[in-house]
């Protein structure tokens, strides 16, 4: 919405643009208005973008009124929160960014007969982006003063410098994201994409190997496994071998056989040979021992002065046989030499997946962590280890536990801190998430838990001699008291600087007014008057251009007044036989200097840049995608780096090209598995999938791949009339109209004849951008004066 | 008061097609995420699809992908299902469902309509 | 997909008793769970959000908890109007799953 308030009003004299008084005559002694003061209030009109502004034709922005809100000077700069001064125009469509304002001050006659009448009118072209900021603006000639301030503001939830950018922040299943201040959505941890609906996988799972539905997650396609799905699952049953790829049983050295089982160094492997015999590999799981005198057997087992060399280990007997020796062995061993422990884990005796260990006549369970007891039978005690971090009860459960965590902390062990930052915090402040709460960082000149409130600088009483304090944010503003200034009022005013008197008056500075001491041929407050000398002095014509007058104001006598009849914008010029010209000031022509050369004629604006005529000046508008002074630079799209996942940007007209990698597809490379998104079509496009490539079907009105371009035909044929300027909008047009014109098509002659150019009762005869005056009679010259 | 109406329900024969409707009344219907949740006779809800307020994402249940459309028009405040191929096992009651923007619950939900796959 | 598991699938109580259905996901899904109360004939009415939050208009006798993978409804002290199927529901991920439901029933 575009909002306008009115600040404060000066219409000392409390008089009407025509020179009569609001109310009543004038005071025959000072001249001043008598009786009532005016009834003021305000009209707004507000229209497209206008180089030399026009007051006819359609507000096409909207328009507006205040009621009364004052009389002759008021201020209101003070009175925050009252609506009776604001004008809200809200709009339906995207922010054009220039403008046209019309304000108009006008004295309400508060009766059915007489009709209301204008004060004082300011016109204002410009540009204004959105923003929260408000901008002053000061009508500072005629009658009357006025102060205004202006701004536009977005919708919420729309973004930009058109307010047509829209950002909702949302927390569910179809995005995870904020909005920055730009409408940027700004995806919550653990998510990622253009609607944040991708989960961010677990750091390190495998892009080729491995996916995920939820952040921190990796789910291993067939045929992979590991926490990162890095690891192929070799062919079942493989025993020692490894893979490269899913399935594959590479066998490791010194084994061989399908499945890596079969051992081709039994030698080196169980080094069988016993009592220094030599081993030799015959085969696979095949062997030859070679024994070492007094020695025999398949393993050199058999010693023939058997218990000499105590064979019998770990304490067991040697008693001497026909074969050799036999021992005798103590509890817990076996073998032909005592040397093998019995395997006391044959059967299993542990229980719930319990690892058994072999120990020398006798087992031990190691449990897993869930279970305790010789056997694993007893359910353990997880609490005792305190895996609860920050919960208020550790509750053991049977083979497991449960952390009932504190408010803010969530996750198996009440580690994990909840981010508790959901947008909260207004004003562009930051959150900083706590436990179990928040904190809103804010911005100068905000605070609250949500930085919520501005922060009152008037609360120190900043301003001097009674000034009043204005509080705005993050600063103030200080509404000085008649007769000072400066921005704590800490300055007597001197209405003399800058000089207000006209026409070399002498100016004298009083408490809270001025007085001009006017030369013998001025009058008026600011002696901006020219006195009707012609009633008392006689006036003698010196030339077509010139007139001469009796004044005792100069050495000699004579005083020379020059014809305004070249207007604002020329000089007169005498030519013999009363004839004249008019010598124009640079950017004018014609007769009587009254138009604008059309500095537009050389065609200075580059492609399909819309040239403005300005006076002796003018102005590019360039299309979409290009810019500068004579949109001779093509903007780079690419600046932003918009192009993900290792996709190469290439800069167009307005637009974009991403060359993307790896299989990675969609306008800016984001997705896996479309070309398609809300985002790729500008302007209502509609985008359909064709494989390896995206193609859009524009609305009328657009082109280019991404429907970004302006199609010239809303201008083609030119629909403003009379010399009037085409600019390109979106399906629509806009007309800049040359001096003179006005309306949505240029159609309509100004009326150059308001307000009233004639003087005594003179009769104005309108033209194509000149007016004639026809005077009464007893008058002459060109405004009959 | 918030309202969701759904209409369209009815007798259908397999690999038939119907066209279900949810007129919503009550709240700003472009600024909520809808969904349509079914309930088959004597069982449990299964979410079928949902569409995001401007209607720029879908998303759809397996056993319904490539045969179901949902769609909506913001500016009649209504909600679609377009089902296609229908078979028996789609014979449910039918509910349209909207939902916030934050935890994607659905916080109101219609009183269902009725879809009978049979020949 | 996050498969959800209620239990139990049944229980029977009287008026004023304590009830507690549990909920379990198979993966992590932080505190997007919600739960459902639905009478027979009837649509489905939303109780908790988010885990822990109270739908409004909804009696204080009902709370939620739990995050992560395993979340707890509990009714303070049930009343006549409380005898009904009970659905929770993920919301972080599409495909949305519900539980099974689990029906309280009058002992």
């Known amino acids: 919405q575009f909002e306008l308030e009115i600040l404060s009003m000066q219409n000392v004299n409390g008089e009407l643009q025509n020179g009569n008084c609001c109310g009543g005559a004038r005071n025959p002694g000072d001249r001043k208005c008598t009786r009532d003061e005016c009834d003021t209030y305000f009209k707004v009109c507000l229209k497209e973008y206008q180089s030399r502004v026009t007051a006819g034709g359609p507000c096409s922005f909207g328009s507006g009124s205040t009621p009364v809100i004052g009389g002759n000077t008021f201020n209101l700069k003070a009175s925050r929160g009252n609506d009776r001064n604001r004008i809200v125009l809200p709009f339906s469509f995207a922010w054009p960014r220039s403008y046209t304002l019309l304000v108009e001050a006008w004295d309400s006659s508060n009766d059915t007969v007489q009709p209301d009448s204008i004060i004082e009118k300011a016109s204002h072209s410009g540009m204004i982006n959105p923003s929260r900021q408000w901008q002053t603006l000061k009508q500072n000639t005629g009658v009357a003063h006025f102060e205004y301030q202006i701004r536009v503001t977005c919708d919420d939830y729309y973004y930009g410098f058109g307010c047509n950018k829209f950002c909702r922040p949302r927390d569910d299943f179809f995005g995870h994201y904020a909005c920055d201040q730009n409408g940027n959505k700004t995806c919550m941890e653990g998510w990622m994409g253009p609607e944040c609906n991708r989960a961010i996988c677990r750091q390190g799972c495998s892009p080729k190997h491995g996916s995920c539905k939820l952040p921190g997650d990796c789910r291993c396609q067939y045929g992979w496994q590991g926490l990162y799905c890095d690891k192929c699952i070799p062919h079942p049953g493989c025993v020692h071998g490894i893979c490269n790829e899913p399935w594959q049983c590479l066998c490791e050295t010194n084994w061989g056989g399908q499945l890596c089982d079969k051992d081709l160094n039994y030698c080196g492997t169980h080094q069988p040979c016993l009592n220094g015999g030599t081993c030799s590999n015959t085969g696979p799981d095949k062997y030859q021992c070679s024994c070492p005198e007094g020695y025999s057997g398949p393993n050199c087992e058999i010693a023939e002065h058997a218990c000499l060399s105590d064979p019998c280990h770990n304490r067991g007997s040697c008693k001497e046989t026909s074969l050799g020796f036999e021992c005798e062995c103590s509890p817990g061993w076996t073998g032909p030499t005592c040397s093998t422990n019995i395997d006391d884990c044959s059967p299993n005796n542990c229980s719930h997946g319990g690892t058994c260990q072999d120990l020398v006549n006798g087992f031990k369970c190691v449990c897993p962590p869930q279970w305790t007891g010789k056997t694993c039978q007893l359910d353990a005690n997880e609490c005792e280890a305190k895996p609860c971090v920050n919960a208020k009860s550790c509750k053991n459960l049977i083979a497991s536990y449960y952390c009932d965590c504190l408010p803010g902390w969530m996750g198996q062990n009440c580690d994990i801190n909840i981010n508790d930052c959901l947008g909260q915090c207004q004003n562009d402040a930051s959150c900083r998430d706590l436990v179990n709460g928040y904190r809103c960082i804010c911005p100068p000149g905000y605070a609250g838990d949500h930085c919520e409130r501005d922060i009152d600088e008037c609360a120190s009483n900043p301003c001097l001699n009674g000034g009043h304090c204005q509080n705005e944010i993050n600063r103030f503003q200080c509404l000085c008291p008649t007769g000072f200034s400066g921005n704590l009022c800490q300055l007597d005013i001197d209405y003399c600087e800058p000089n207000p008197c006209q026409n070399g008056a002498q100016c004298y500075n009083r408490a809270s007014d001025y007085f001009c001491k006017c030369p013998e041929d001025y009058e008026g407050k600011n002696c901006s008057h020219l006195k009707d000398h012609c009633r008392t002095t006689p006036c003698e014509v010196i030339d077509s251009c010139t007139v001469a007058m009796a004044s005792n104001d100069t050495p000699e006598g004579v005083r020379y007044i020059s014809s305004n009849v070249c207007g604002p914008h020329g000089k007169c010029k005498s030519q013999s036989g009363g004839k004249f010209t008019c010598d124009c000031n640079k950017g004018f022509t014609g007769t009587y200097c009254h138009e604008n050369i059309n500095d537009c004629e050389s065609n200075p604006c580059r492609n399909g840049g819309t040239c403005i005529d300005g006076v002796n000046s003018y102005k590019c508008i360039c299309s979409d995608g290009w810019e500068g002074a004579y949109c001779e630079t093509n903007i780079n799209d690419c600046s932003q780096n918009p192009c993900h996942n290792g996709g190469t940007c290439r800069d167009l007209v307005n637009d974009f090209y991403c060359d993307c990698k790896n299989g990675w597809k969609g306008k800016t490379c984001h997705s896996r598995d479309s070309q398609c998104d809300e985002a790729t079509c500008n302007n209502g496009g509609t985008c359909y999938d064709e494989g390896d490539a995206f193609k859009c079907m524009c609305p009328g009105g657009w082109e280019g791949t991404t429907c970004n371009i302006a199609r010239n035909s809303s201008c083609l044929p030119n629909p403003c009339h009379n010399g009037g300027t085409c600019v390109v909008n979106g399906e629509s047009f806009t007309c800049v109209c040359k001096e003179g014109w006005e309306g949505p098509i240029c159609a309509q002659n100004t009326n150059d004849c308001s307000p009233h150019p004639c003087y005594n009762s003179g009769t104005c005869v309108d033209g194509d951008n000149w007016y004639r005056c026809e005077c009464a009679p007893g008058f002459a010259g060109p405004d009959c004066r | 008061e918030v309202q969701l109406l759904e209409s369209g329900g009815g007798l259908v024969q397999p690999g038939g097609s119907l066209r279900l409707s949810c007129a919503a009344s009550?709240?700003?219907?472009?600024?909520?995420?809808m969904s349509w949740v079914r309930q088959a006779p004597g069982k449990g809800l299964e979410w079928v699809s949902s569409?995001?307020?401007?209607?720029?994402?879908?998303y759809y249940a397996d056993s319904v992908k490539g045969r179901f459309t949902i769609s909506r028009d913001n500016s009649k405040n209504t909600l679609y299902l377009q089902m296609n191929s229908l078979r028996a096992e789609d014979t449910a009651v039918y509910y349209c469902a909207k939902s916030p923007p934050f935890y994607g619950q659905f916080d109101y939900w219609g009183q269902g309509t009725l879809v009978t796959v049979s020949s | 997909d996050i498969q959800m598991t209620q239990s139990p699938s049944s229980l029977s109580a009287s008026v004023g008793d304590r009830v507690t259905i549990t909920c379990r996901a198979s993966q992590s899904i932080s505190s997007y769970l919600n739960w459902y109360q639905q009478k027979p004939g009837k649509a489905p009415k939303l109780l908790i959000y988010?885990?822990?939050s109270l739908q409004s208009g909804v009696p204080s006798r009902f709370s939620g908890s739990g995050s992560g993978t395993d979340f707890t409804l509990t009714i303070s002290s049930l009343q006549p109007e409380d005898f009904a199927t009970y659905y929770c529901q993920q919301s972080v991920v599409a495909p949305l799953t519900f539980g099974q439901g689990t029906k309280v029933e009058i002992k």
């Open positions: 009550g709240f700003t219907f472009s600024s909520y995420a």
């Open positions: 569409i995001e307020q401007m209607g720029w994402q879908t």
């Open positions: 988010a885990a822990s």
